[in-house]
């Protein structure tokens, strides 16, 4: 004979367990139905009647199949340094994550953050060695010879000094090199400033002293946008 399908509640065979989405009620000594996510057990089962489930009230939830007598309370509202990335519903808790520019210094369960901290900024002469993540702060490092950073930022890395035909002012850790130049190195470099005398700006690598130049030069180009390459530095 085919095995009969047992309807809850039912007494399990000795040594066997209840099926999926059922639980064993110690009092009734029966396998009974669990409540679905978003519900809780309003009345527990007996030998003759199954579990009675009810929906979670506002601001409470259950995420799993369960037989809890009360739904769990959703976490408190997200703080000002957080963003609600998952709303509180009957089936899931609210999740608060740190807003951009912040990272989670102390996390709770379920992906929420207990304490957010502002990402550190690397000052001039320092660049980002390791970017900040959702759970870790920025790590800064001094700009190596031939590179620079002239910003205070949690994202900017040290950039190479620009290459110059003739170096007017050598670059250093916090400043790009300034080139003696007859024309800008960038098509309409944003924010480029032309001075009456020669120079261009982006950076280099070597040590500091301007280069002697035999080339005519007519304008100074001071950089205020992206800056590139170099490796040793002094001035030509």
């Amino acid at each position: 004979l085919p095995a009969q399908v047992a309807f809850t509640p039912y007494a399990p065979e000795p040594g066997s367990t209840c099926r999926l989405r059922e639980y064993y009620d110690q009092t009734a000594q029966m396998c009974c139905s669990k409540c679905s996510p978003g519900q809780h057990a309003k009345v527990f089962c007996t030998k003759t009647s199954d579990t009675v489930c009810d929906s979670c009230e506002d601001s409470t939830y259950t995420q799993l199949w369960n037989w809890v007598p009360e739904c769990l309370s959703c976490g408190s509202r997200c703080s000002s340094d957080q963003v609600e990335t998952q709303a509180c519903t009957r089936e899931q808790n609210r999740i608060c994550t740190c807003r951009p520019g912040w990272y989670c210094a102390l996390s709770k369960q379920e992906g929420s953050c207990r304490q957010c901290m502002r990402l550190s900024k690397c000052g001039p002469g320092f660049g980002v060695a390791r970017p900040g993540t959702e759970t870790s702060d920025v790590v800064c490092k001094p700009c190596a010879p031939g590179t620079f950073s002239n910003t205070t930022s949690s994202t900017d890395i040290c950039r190479p000094h620009q290459i110059c035909n003739v170096v007017a002012i050598p670059g250093n850790a916090s400043m790009d090199a300034v080139c003696t130049s007859t024309s800008p190195t960038r098509s309409m470099a944003p924010g480029a400033v032309h001075l009456p005398q020669p120079v261009s700006t982006r950076s280099q690598h070597t040590q500091p002293t301007p280069e002697p130049s035999t080339a005519p030069s007519t304008s100074f180009l001071l950089p205020m946008g992206p800056s590139p390459p170099a490796e040793g530095s002094t001035g030509d």
């Epitope: 800008p184 960038r186 280069e211 992206p226 390459p229």
Partner: antibody
């Protein structure tokens, strides 16, 4: 007429050294950055190193930093590339090139190239 | 892998117009840096073809033209000739690197 003439290439064993030279004429040598650019057999162009006109500032690709040294003698209108700790992947034709007027990031004149082969 | 991206090959028949693209990013072409183009005929050294996006050195025919927009640039060759068969490379400065960066090169074949 601008002319750039490289020399010094050849066959060298891995770990060995070689010094390339580039004789320049036809322009005011000390007023321009000079570059070395290489091209592995059947491959594309790769910038290697540069030096400012007054020889005070040098620039290197990460792939050669610490192994190659660029220099120039403005009195002789000559550019050099000292290559140490050579590797098989350094095998290429090495070109010397002149930085452009007002913008050293382009090369308005190139030499004919010299072949460097690193092999045991 | 090259910092600037070019199609590996392109082709056209004599008299046709062919365009070669060069795609970069916000740290090179998109940062406002000029794009330069080089032509390398078989067995010879590269030669400057276009500088500062659209400028032609003296001696380069006006059949060659360059343009730039956003994070990409293109080289156009009109009235294609058999002697245009060569490798073409784009190049630009990049904020994060010490020297100019090149595209991987495009081999142009003139058919027929």
């Amino acid at each position: 007429e601008v002319q750039l003439l490289e020399s010094g290439g050849g066959l060298v064993q891995p770990g060995g050294s070689l010094r390339l030279s580039c004789a320049a004429s036809g322009f005011t040598f000390s007023s321009y950055a000079m570059h070395w650019v290489r091209q592995a057999p059947g491959k594309g162009l790769e910038w290697v190193s540069a030096i400012s006109g007054g020889a005070t500032t040098t620039y290197y690709a990460d792939s050669v930093k610490g192994r190659f040294t660029i220099s120039r003698d403005n009195s002789k209108n000559t550019l050099y590339l000292q290559m140490n700790s050579l590797r098989a992947e350094d095998t290429a034709v090495y070109y010397c090139a002149k930085g452009g007027t007002g913008d050293p990031y382009y090369f308005d004149y190139w030499g004919q190239g010299t072949l460097v082969t690193v092999s045991s | 892998q090259s910092v600037l991206t070019q199609p590996p090959s392109a082709s056209g028949t004599p008299g046709q117009r062919v365009t070669i693209s060069c795609t970069g990013s916000s740290s090179n072409i998109g940062a406002g840096y000029d794009v330069h183009w080089y032509q390398q005929l078989p067995g010879t050294a590269p030669k400057l073809l276009i500088y500062r996006n659209n400028q032609r050195p003296s001696g380069v025919p006006d059949r060659f033209s360059g343009s730039k927009s956003g994070t990409s640039a293109s080289l156009a060759i009109s009235g294609l000739r058999s002697e245009d068969e060569a490798d073409y490379y784009c190049a630009a400065r990049d904020d994060g690197l010490s020297g100019p960066v090149f595209g991987g090169g495009t081999k142009l074949t003139v058919l027929g």
